[in-house]
């Protein structure tokens, strides 16, 4: 979309913002929209919060289409109510040593984050806090009964999906990489980003990747056969093109994606990889994009919750879609 | 009630100027986009200019782009057209008009002031 | 985009049904696909009106006698049964590219 032709706004009055969300300009100057924030993603027509000192970022020169919103080089960080500095570590729990990097926080888990499945001699099992310990373990005790009205729909866990070895050191750099975040949306197309060194010069950069949890159509519920109370991998009865502002992906794919439960537990990516996906626009233009695939998923009660100041933030918009 | 006011129309020598003015009322002015349109004498409607909510896009007849500005005063509930160089083919009754930005363009007019532009 | 009218005058009784073509020189789909074809009407010694938008909706205070269809790049306007305050000029417009243009107007007069 140019910025050519007349304004022409939707029928609707301008919209209601979430408080902090600021009212701005399109970016053609035409329509009055909610501005786009951190880590979502932007276009001509979605500009990003400008009172945030955000820009969309978009990438290589050639998708100047579809971006991410991203801070200013430099932009410090604001986490757990504490100003971090651009390329300051800290560590936000005993769990977490995360890395502020131009207003964004990425964070590696210093517990194991490993899925544990159900299994014959361990059929729910859930991981507790020990009295004294930084880190929570499995344990294999029955479940409380759990009043839950609908699907538990998380839209991640930290999952078993590592970059490079934390450890590894390579020409006089210590090579990081963070976990990448949560999807920003429990259907649909999101993005989830994380901080990385592992570049020919040891410097620190943000990368991001588009992700689909599960798609919005899908009733999955519908699907839970009789007597269970979960569907972690539901089948995908045809190959999909995925869509994107517009643009739609060049090839169909048989994506796998995540299912939901009954019972209060939470289907959230157990493995997943990254590939590019070519998307192609009505006015001919392609773009490529990197992409979430998941491989697995694991259903399970480690949901997530407010009792870690990290997890609660890095969840929290997991649910009602707000990104 | 709502009321759009055009004035600072009137008789003007060829190369000269006018500041046209509208005065809008009854309705909340930042809401909206505002336009100018013009009638020739005996001829049809013209689309001469308009301007977004805030003043930060104007869009006007690639034609008079060079000499005429529309822009807005939301403190004033005002909007104003700028005309510059006038020439004879420019005398036309200057019709105000709001412009929803949505569904219709040009939902209320004024009255129109007359610009002559004569030696 | 040049809008052309026909015809340019149209007598009728009042009572009559008149209808009023309207034809652009390319198609006035909106890059948002949306058409902005519009009627307004002017009365003699009035600022015009407007009557219809997108093509086929009724301004708010409109009689229902006023009906607006087309596609593409031809649109009608029809008055079902004409009544004296109907007179005057209708100017179709399309607001889908720039620049903004009207028609030439069709004169509405009593035979």
């Known amino acids: 979309q140019n910025c050519s032709g007349p304004c022409r706004c939707p029928d609707e009055p301008a919209p209601r913002c979430p408080a902090g969300v600021s009212l701005v300009l399109d970016g053609c100057g035409c329509c009055r929209v909610c501005a786009k924030q951190l880590g979502e993603l932007c276009t001509e027509r979605d500009p990003c919060d400008p009172h945030k000192g955000l820009f969309c970022d978009f990438g290589s020169p050639a998708n100047r289409k579809i971006g991410v919103c991203t801070a200013k080089d430099g932009a410090p960080c604001i986490f757990g109510g504490t100003v971090y500095r651009s390329g300051e570590s800290f560590q936000s729990s005993c769990k977490y040593q995360c890395t502020c990097l131009d207003g964004a926080v990425g964070c590696m888990p210093l517990c194991s984050m490993d899925v544990r499945l159900p299994s014959p001699d361990c059929p729910f099992p859930r991981r507790v806090k020990l009295p004294g310990k930084c880190c929570e373990e499995w344990v294999c005790d029955e479940p409380k009964d759990q009043t839950v009205v609908g699907p538990a729909l998380a839209a991640y866990r930290l999952e078993d999906t590592f970059g490079p070895d934390p450890t590894m050191i390579r020409a006089n750099c210590l090579v990081q990489t963070t976990e990448w975040s949560a999807c920003s949306k429990t259907c649909g197309m999101g993005i989830s980003t994380r901080v990385t060194n592992d570049n020919a010069s040891c410097r620190l950069e943000k990368q991001s990747r588009l992700c689909m949890v599960r798609p919005c159509e899908a009733d999955l519920e519908e699907n839970i056969k009789k007597g269970k109370k979960c569907i972690r991998t539901p089948k995908i009865s045809k190959p999909i093109k995925f869509e994107l502002s517009g643009c739609t992906s060049m090839k169909t794919y048989r994506a796998k994606f995540c299912g939901v439960c009954t019972d209060g537990r939470c289907c959230t990516p157990h493995r997943t990889t990254t590939l590019p996906v070519e998307f192609k626009c009505p006015d001919g233009e392609v773009m490529k994009k990197n992409m979430m695939f998941i491989k697995t998923c694991a259903c399970h009660y480690n949901c997530p919750g407010d009792n870690d100041i990290f997890e609660s933030l890095y969840y929290r918009k997991m649910y009602g879609d707000m990104a | 009630e709502v009321q759009l006011v055009e004035s600072g129309g009137g008789l003007v020598q060829p190369g000269g100027s006018l500041r046209l003015s509208c005065a809008a009322s009854?309705?909340?002015?930042?809401?909206?986009?505002m336009a100018w349109v013009r009638q020739a004498p005996g001829k049809g409607l013209e689309w001469v200019a308009n301007i977004n909510y805030e003043g930060s896009r104007t869009d006007l007849l690639a034609s008079l782009k060079s000499r005429f500005t529309i822009s807005r005063d939301n403190a004033k509930n005002s909007v104003y057209l700028q005309m510059n160089s006038l020439r004879a083919e420019d005398t036309a009754v200057y019709y105000c008009a709001r412009d929803t930005s949505r569904g219709s363009y040009f939902d209320v007019w004024g009255a129109g002031t007359t610009v002559t532009v004569s030696s | 985009v040049v809008m052309t009218q026909t015809p340019l005058s149209l007598p009728v009784s009042l009572g009559d049904q008149a209808s009023i073509s309207c034809r652009s020189s390319?198609?006035?789909?909106?890059?948002?696909?949306?058409?902005?074809l519009e009627w307004y009407l002017q009365k003699p010694g009035q600022s015009p009106q407007l009557l219809i938008y997108k093509v086929s909706n009724r301004d708010s205070g409109v009689p229902d006698r006023f009906s607006g269809s087309g596609s593409g790049t031809d649109f009608t306007l029809k008055i079902s049964r004409v009544e004296a305050e109907d007179l005057g000029v209708y100017y179709c417009f399309q607001g889908s590219h720039f620049p903004l243009t009207f028609g030439q107007g069709t004169k509405l007069e009593i035979k």
């Open positions: 390319q198609s006035i789909v909106h890059y948002n696909g949306n058409t902005y």
């Open positions: 009854g309705f909340t002015f930042s809401d909206y986009y």
